[in-house]
């Protein structure tokens, strides 16, 4: 806390300017006043200022906006913002994307700090939903942001918005995330052709449930076999092996080598052996010929 | 961390000069600022010299037109070059770097000094 002092002659600022950064915290306290500062907030930025001196300048800002700062001052804080706390943040409302922007601007080449994610949760609170240009500025800034929300969250997001997300975006979304976002994705993208539409929902696959995996092993897709061993378990185990061979088309080779992890391990378990050395990949652990295979789940339902 | 380490000073007469150097090793991505500081004995530390990274300098008024600052980016170095030294000059000079660093609780903002080197001027 910088004590209260007078302002030495001659040395009460008129304007915020370089010749400020001469001036010992003290003097800032005593000869800036606040209303200019909050006048040419935007010149603070380009003035070197030590972050002693940032630290007088959010207390002056502080005491003459104790309910929260305006958006014509938070859209300048440039470095100033990294001194704030979810606290101060917290008081704003800020409704601009160009303010969004500029602040995350300050926060670039760093992980999401508590400062930034408050930031981000009172402006997409204000705005009511996750619209398709704050989706866009958000994973410029944060790829990973989309798979930070809870599927609550997602639920907001509107199919339009879907066009924003490309595929390293969902990189570290959760089988809970992709099925909140995937029926999204279908809808977003339902007028497009065959080939269009699997490059453009490919990413959001790992959401699809079963049918939709044998309608896609209809149209000749070549799904390669990172996203099938991101597909859900429970929608690939009812597929027949032809259903995963038109599924994968060439990229069917690279079962053998995945044979031991989830889902292809589950899906092997559940086919007969006959059919799987229809593949001629030596994939072994299908249901030996002559057994009978009861679906349980089937019994109790009719019962 | 950022280590900054200053050379150069010296004893001179009136009149000559001196070039100070300043070389930051560690951490030295995000420097922003880089800044030289003198005190003076029985003195407050004042600001000289600011440079920023793009190479914007201000002075401090009793310096200007005899004081230079520079910086080398790719040496991660700054530089004060004094001319026409006088009496008053006399203080130890301190470099000072500021940069944005990572932490877990997300940027914050940080503040590096040398040890400093000494300038004498003679009359």
């Known amino acids: 806390e910088v004590e209260k002092t007078a302002c030495p002659s001659g040395k009460k600022a008129r304007e915020i300017d370089e010749s400020l950064i001469f001036y010992k915290k003290w003097e800032l306290e005593a000869c800036v006043d606040a209303a200019l500062l909050a006048t040419q907030m935007d010149r603070v930025n380009a003035i070197p200022f030590t972050y002693e001196q940032l630290d007088v300048l959010k207390h002056k800002l502080d005491e003459l906006y104790p309910q929260g700062y305006p958006e014509s001052v938070i859209q300048h804080l440039g470095y100033l913002f990294l001194k704030m706390s979810p606290e101060d943040i917290r008081k704003w409302n800020v409704t601009s994307l160009e303010t969004l922007k500029a602040l995350l601007e300050v926060n670039k080449g760093h992980e999401m700090s508590p400062q930034v994610a408050t930031l981000i949760d009172r402006f997409v609170k204000g705005r009511g939903q996750l619209d398709k240009d704050t989706l866009d500025t958000l994973t410029a800034f944060y790829p990973g942001y989309l798979c930070s929300l809870s599927p609550e969250e997602l639920s907001s997001v509107p199919p339009s918005s879907i066009w924003a997300v490309r595929p390293q975006d969902l990189d570290t979304c959760d089988p809970r995330q992709l099925d909140v976002l995937y029926p999204k994705a279908r809808l977003a993208f339902q007028n497009m052709n065959g080939s269009e539409y699997f490059v453009k929902i490919q990413s959001f696959l790992g959401g699809a449930p079963t049918e939709d995996l044998k309608a896609l092993s209809q149209q000749n897709v070549s799904m390669d076999l990172a996203t099938f061993m991101k597909l859900r378990t429970d929608a690939v185990l009812p597929l027949t092996v032809a259903e995963v061979q038109k599924l994968l088309g060439p990229h069917v080779e690279g079962l053998k080598a995945e044979e031991r992890h989830r889902p292809v391990r589950d899906w092997i378990l559940r086919q007969r052996q006959d059919d799987l050395d229809t593949l001629g990949l030596g994939l072994q652990g299908g249901i030996p010929n002559g057994y009978l295979v009861l679906d349980l789940s089937m019994q109790e339902a009719l019962s | 961390q950022v280590q900054l380490v200053e050379s150069g000073g010296g004893l001179v007469q009136a009149g000559g000069s001196l070039r100070l150097s300043c070389v930051a090793s560690?951490?030295?991505?995000?420097?922003?600022?880089m800044r030289w500081y003198r005190q003076a004995p029985g003195k407050e530390r004042e600001l000289v010299a600011v440079?920023?990274?793009?190479?914007?300098?201000i002075y401090l008024d009793a310096v200007k037109g005899r004081f230079t600052i520079s910086r080398d980016n790719a040496n991660n170095a700054i530089y004060l070059e004094m001319n026409s030294l006088k009496p008053e000059d006399t203080a130890v000079y301190v470099c000072?770097?500021?940069?944005?660093?990572?932490?877990?609780?997300?940027?914050?903002?940080?503040?590096?000094f040398g040890q400093g080197t000494q300038v004498t001027v003679s009359s």
């Open positions: 440079i920023t990274r793009g190479g914007y300098a």
């Open positions: 560690g951490s030295t991505s995000n420097i922003n600022n």
């Open positions: 000072n770097a500021d940069r944005v660093e990572g932490t877990s609780g997300g940027p914050q903002l940080r503040d590096y």
